[in-house]
């Protein structure tokens, strides 16, 4: 759809005659009837095709004609059309002297044509005015003309229809060659989709206007690229959302079972080194000196009795000294002055010549000890207890008081804490250095496999079109994270360009 | 009184070269669109080409499109045909005319004979 | 290309006779149509244009009719400088092209 302007701009008749030959009287009052057509071959009378128009009366003989279309006039005179500009055409203009005020042809004589001209013309849309001069032996019209399209179409021809929008249908301006020019912030054919903050995850972010970074279930962060962990996951993170991946030296389904006690609690004093042994359990190796479970108990260096021959033992700062009984002497009273004449040995020990009777040694009964049989057997200074047992001195004997999970003499055996079958619901035992591991069948969990759990709600494949599914452990239910272009529930949907445009 | 006259013509070679012109009077030769048509011994009348009243619009027949030229000088009010590789199909009778019919305008030149021959 | 087919390619007549010589188009040529005369020697002469427009100057025993393809002309009464050849034109598309001819002799 366009329109086919025509300025006229000067029409001489000096001699004020018709194309007869005749003088109009007084003058030519002049008008003019214009005709336009499709292109011919040859110009040939026949219907205007592309339409007609007429004017008023313009001057009388010769006269210049006033650009009036600022002021709402008729020149440029305009001649629309609502089809494909072909490019071609046929114009004819037609000069007539109207007698009187009736301008309708039926009402003039056949003889008051002035002139006529018909031409055939190229003309692009567009294109600057084309100036024009058709002369004759009596007349000469100077005129110029142009084609333009009509409000919201473009292109070579007017054929392009586009109408500018900032709607639910569209945010764009149009291009002088009808193309759609987006707003900015908006993309796409008819720059209905949102152009995203920028990052914002193509997979895990959308946005319904430009700039936004909204999150599919199971993503967050500023960009939706970072996942949201299982509800309740505690020292974990997730690549995908609702995983529970947990950090070193935890376990569990919420990573909230500590693996490494040791470093999470250091629980061992004095510089003792630390084992982990189990879910909350560790073994303090003592430096010397130390003792108790976490090694937080200082050991007295006499604790050791390291003064033999009844010597006493005085702590000092820097370590111990031993105080001899008569007849010996050494650091630790371990040289003796006497002989087995000197009736040595106590506790009912015998006595033996060493060393052609420079030196002698006590044999001693049961339960004492040390070179003179001085010493009850203290049967717990050997730490015979394993495991961590605590020794007792029990008389002539001893005992060894076990941890949980240890048994036997010296604690040397680990009870089965399987063997009562403590997992339910089918679970599997899993004996441990310290306690046991239930693995639970699906549907159950739990330390002992006592919680019933919903299914994986995954397993069904309740998403459509590709989306991929999430099983919130925490509700029992599944998440579908829908692709571009679907939504719904279960992505069920898709998201169809309207069926049609109002424009 | 109105003339069109044709000159131009002659024998030329196949492959030659040869310029028409149309001299025209006794009217505004500058108000209409003129046309060559040609006649080949013993055959009908054919079209050759068309330039409009101010030059801007051309058409010519398939078998000489490429080969053939047609321009105008309003100043001087005469029409030119330039034709070059030229072939003996290409032997005729050479018109200019100025048609419009819608004007009642129907002029034709007697016509110049090119002969292409070795 | 818009073809014309001439009918007849010749045709024997005698003086007061009424003729009529058609011409149709391979398509819809809209009333662009012309009928000429040709005279051994001469320039072809415009007898109608418009399908059924009398050119000035022409009598008034020729006459056109037709629309679409089908065209045609008459000569009511034939008189003897009427013996000559015939041929209609289409100006309705490029190319123009014209009709075979009719030879119009006396019998």
């Known amino acids: 759809s366009g329109v086919f302007q025509l300025q006229l701009q000067e029409f001489i008749n000096e001699r004020g005659v018709l194309a007869s030959g005749r003088p109009c009287e007084p003058g030519c009052r002049t008008f003019f009837r214009v005709c336009l057509k499709h292109f011919q071959a040859v110009v040939s009378p026949g219907p205007c095709t592309f339409g007609t128009v007429s004017t008023p009366v313009l001057g009388t003989n010769s006269f210049a004609v006033r650009d009036d279309s600022s002021g709402g006039g008729r020149n440029p005179l305009q001649l629309p059309f609502n089809f494909t500009w072909p490019g071609t055409f046929s114009l004819i203009i037609e000069a007539w002297h109207a007698p009187g005020d009736d301008l309708r042809p039926e009402a003039l004589p056949p003889d008051a044509l002035i002139s006529k001209i018909a031409i055939q013309g190229s003309l692009a849309v567009g294109q600057n005015w084309l100036l024009d001069e058709q002369t004759s032996t009596l007349t000469r019209l100077r005129y110029s003309y142009r084609v333009i399209c009509s409000d919201n179409y473009y292109g070579d021809n007017c054929s392009r229809l586009c109408k500018k929008r900032n709607d639910h249908f569209g945010h764009y301006v149009c291009q002088p060659d009808g193309n759609l020019s987006c707003l900015p912030g908006w993309t796409g054919e008819y720059c209905q989709q949102p152009i995203c903050l920028s990052g914002c995850h193509e997979q895990n972010g959308y946005c319904s206007k430009p700039a936004e970074c909204l999150c599919r279930p199971g993503w967050q962060g500023r960009l939706c690229n970072e996942c949201i962990p299982h509800n309740g996951c505690r020292h974990g993170t997730c690549s995908t959302p609702w995983q529970c991946t947990c950090d070193e030296g935890w376990g569990g389904l919420f990573c909230d079972q500590d693996l490494n006690y040791c470093t999470h609690h250091s629980p061992c004093k004095n510089g003792a080194t630390c084992s982990n042994s189990g879910q909350r359990s560790y073994t303090c190796t003592c430096r010397p000196g130390y003792t108790g479970v976490d090694c937080e108990l200082e050991l007295s260096e006499c604790d050791s009795n390291p003064c033999r021959n009844g010597g006493s033992c005085k702590d000092q700062e820097d370590g111990y000294h031993c105080l001899c009984p008569p007849g010996y002497y050494g650091l630790h009273c371990e040289h003796s002055t006497l002989s087995c004449a000197d009736s040595p040995c106590f506790n009912g020990g015998s006595c033996r010549e060493r060393n052609q009777g420079a030196n002698y040694a006590c044999e001693c009964p049961p339960n004492f000890t040390g070179s003179n049989c001085e010493k009850k057997v203290d049967r717990c200074t050997s730490n015979p207890c394993a495991n961590g047992g605590q020794c007792l001195n029990r008389g002539p004997s001893r005992m060894c008081r076990c941890r949980p999970g240890f048994t036997g003499t010296y604690c040397e055996l680990h009870v089965s804490d399987c063997a009562r079958n403590p997992c339910a619901h089918g679970g599997t035992c899993h004996d441990l250095e310290n306690g046991l591991m239930c693995t639970c069948p699906a549907g159950f969990s739990g330390r002992r496999c006592e919680v019933r759990t919903s299914i994986d709600a995954c397993a069904s494949s309740p998403c459509f079109n590709r989306a991929t599914c999430y099983t919130d452990l925490s509700t029992d239910t599944f998440v579908c994270n829908c692709p571009y272009g679907f939504v719904g529930s279960r992505c069920e949907f898709p998201v169809g360009l309207p069926p049609s445009f109002p424009w | 009184e109105v003339q069109l006259v044709e000159s131009g013509g002659g024998l030329v070679q196949p492959g030659g070269s040869l310029r028409l012109s149309c001299a025209a009077s006794?009217?505004?030769?500058?108000?209409?669109?003129m046309y060559w048509i040609r006649q080949a011994p013993g055959k009908g009348l054919e079209w050759v080409a068309f330039?409009?009243?101010?030059?801007?619009?051309?058409y010519y027949r398939d078998s000489v499109k490429g080969r053939f030229t047609i321009s105008r000088d309003n100043s001087k009010s005469t029409l030119y045909l330039q034709m070059n590789s030229l072939r003996a199909e290409d032997t005729a009778v050479y018109h200019c005319?100025?048609?419009?019919?819608?004007?009642?305008?129907?002029?034709w030149g007697q016509g110049t004979m090119v002969t292409v021959s070795s | 290309d818009i073809q014309m087919t001439q009918s007849p390619s010749s045709l024997s007549a005698s003086v007061g006779d009424r003729v009529t010589i058609t011409c149709r188009a391979s398509e819809d040529i809209y009333s662009n149509l012309a009928w000429y005369q040709k005279k051994p020697g001469k320039s072809p002469k415009l007898l109608i244009y418009?399908?059924?427009r009398l050119q000035d100057g022409v009598p008034s025993r020729f006459s056109g009719s037709g629309s679409g393809t089908d065209y045609t002309l008459t000569i009511s009464s034939l008189q003897p400088e009427d013996f000559a050849t015939y041929f209609c034109l289409q100006g309705s598309k490029f190319p123009l092209t014209f009709g075979q001819g009719t030879k119009l002799e006396i019998k």
């Open positions: 005319a100025a048609l419009n019919w819608e004007l009642g305008i129907d002029y």
């Open positions: 006794g009217f505004t030769f500058s108000n209409y669109g």
């Open positions: 418009a399908a059924n």
């Open positions: 330039i409009s009243h101010g030059g801007g619009i051309t």
